[in-house]
Interface confidence: medium
């Protein structure tokens, strides 16, 4: 069954490199026979030299957000990291309640786009702490 850590599937609400979606050491996912590198590749050389002649499109494997096309960030998804859309106004985001709580996540979201911040949705103030919904809202 799904691990409880999956309840919070986002990265910190900060752009890379601060948000943990920029291929920092330790941010690679390791499942199955993926050990410390993404899919068994050398993180430092093979992927960056072989795969990133062009900017990655949505869903493409990446190491850091600079590998992705404009409007995308590099975030954890399943067993790898892929280029995902930067969040738009009204889209669900996740704010971590304590430092380091994003470390075990399998699914991450991008950060909110320019001029937006991840804030609790107004009609969810009464909800329990664990189920409060955050969305990208204008500053």
């Amino acid at each position: 069954t799904l691990n409880s850590v999956l309840n919070s599937n986002a990265i910190k609400n900060l752009p890379p490199p601060l948000g943990g979606a920029a291929g920092h050491p330790g941010s690679a996912v390791s499942f199955g026979n993926d050990h410390s590198t993404l899919d068994g590749y050398s993180r430092r050389t093979t992927l960056s030299s072989k795969m990133y002649h062009t900017k990655g499109q949505e869903g493409s494997v990446c190491l850091r957000s600079s590998d992705c096309a404009s409007g995308l960030c590099c975030a954890r998804h399943f067993w790898s990291k892929i280029c995902k859309p930067v969040l738009k106004e009204g889209q669900v985001c996740t704010k971590h309640r304590r430092k380091g709580s994003h470390g075990l996540e399998i699914f991450q979201r991008c950060y909110c786009g320019e001029g937006l911040s991840c804030r609790i949705q107004k009609d969810h103030h009464q909800a329990s702490n664990s189920s409060r919904l955050h969305t990208c809202q204008r500053h």
Partner: antibody
Framework: QVQLVESGGGLVQPGGSLRLSCAAS????????MSWVRQAPGKGLEWVSG????????HYADSVKGRFTISRDNSKNTLYLQMNSLRAEDTAVYYC?????????WGQGTLVTVSS | DIALTQPASVSGSPGQSITISCTGT?????????VSWYQQHPGKAPKLMIH???NRPSGVSNRFSGSKSGNTASLTISGLQAEDEADYYC???????????FGGGTKLTVLG
């Protein structure tokens, strides 16, 4: 545009084998995880298997584990599913799907019929 | 194991809004809100309509929206059109082992 074309389906006897292929075009095949999903006649979707972009990491549904093998040839932009020890309950349309933001592109499917 | 439950069928008239539910246990849809929705017309391949619970891929009409409350994810189709008649599947992920899990599917009928 993204295109996935399955082939290799057909009629096979119980206990037999079949190898499905999926030819991919319109995207950088080696940058994406890929999957096989099947659908029995008149039934819902069932995920069969997934493979990482290099092919070193594979995952299977319990119902096919030990009988099916997923693989890929990135130089040929082709995904494969080797199906052994086939059973009547494996009868289905088999779709290959790109695992981008979830299963974001699908082929049209190839029908596998297991019957004596 | 994860199980996602959908109604077998829903119907609506053109122009109306309908909602299809997908209910799971706290360890799948509720505790883990990464849910996707697929549309499948008869004899055709499925098409991704919503990912991450509420996000539409490019090219998908804004008449389609997704949400989640507690253990139930929902797909809402507004301004129902004849071409919306299809089967709809919700899908989530289990990670031990890693597998995709689909709901049983919901047949949407557009009346009239």
């Amino acid at each position: 545009q993204v295109q996935l074309v399955e082939s290799g389906g057909g009629l096979v006897q119980p206990g037999g084998s079949l190898r499905l292929s999926c030819a991919a075009s319109g995207f950088t095949f080696s940058s994406y995880w890929m999957s096989w999903v099947r659908q029995a006649p008149g039934k819902g979707l069932e995920w069969v298997s997934g493979i990482s972009y290099s092919g070193s990491n594979t995952h299977y549904a319990d119902s096919v584990k030990g009988r099916f093998t997923i693989s890929r040839d990135n130089s040929k932009n082709t995904l494969y599913l080797q199906m052994n020890s086939l059973r009547a309950e494996d009868t289905a349309v088999y779709y290959c799907a790109r695992m981008g933001i979830d299963l974001d592109y699908w082929g049209q499917g190839t029908l596998v019929t297991v019957s004596s | 194991d994860i199980a996602l439950t959908q109604p077998a069928s829903v119907s609506g008239s053109p122009g109306q809004s309908i909602t299809i539910s997908c209910t799971g246990t706290s360890s799948d849809v509720g505790g883990f809100n990464y849910v996707s929705w697929y549309q499948q017309h008869p004899g055709k391949a499925p098409k991704l309509m919503i990912h991450d619970g509420s996000n539409r891929p490019s090219g998908v009409s804004n008449r389609f929206s997704g949400s989640k409350s507690g253990n139930t994810a929902s797909l809402t189709i507004s301004g129902l059109q004849a071409e919306d008649e299809a089967d709809y599947y919700c899908q989530s992920w289990d990670v031990s082992p890693i597998t995709a899990v689909f709901g049983g599917g919901t047949k949407l009928t557009v009346l009239g």
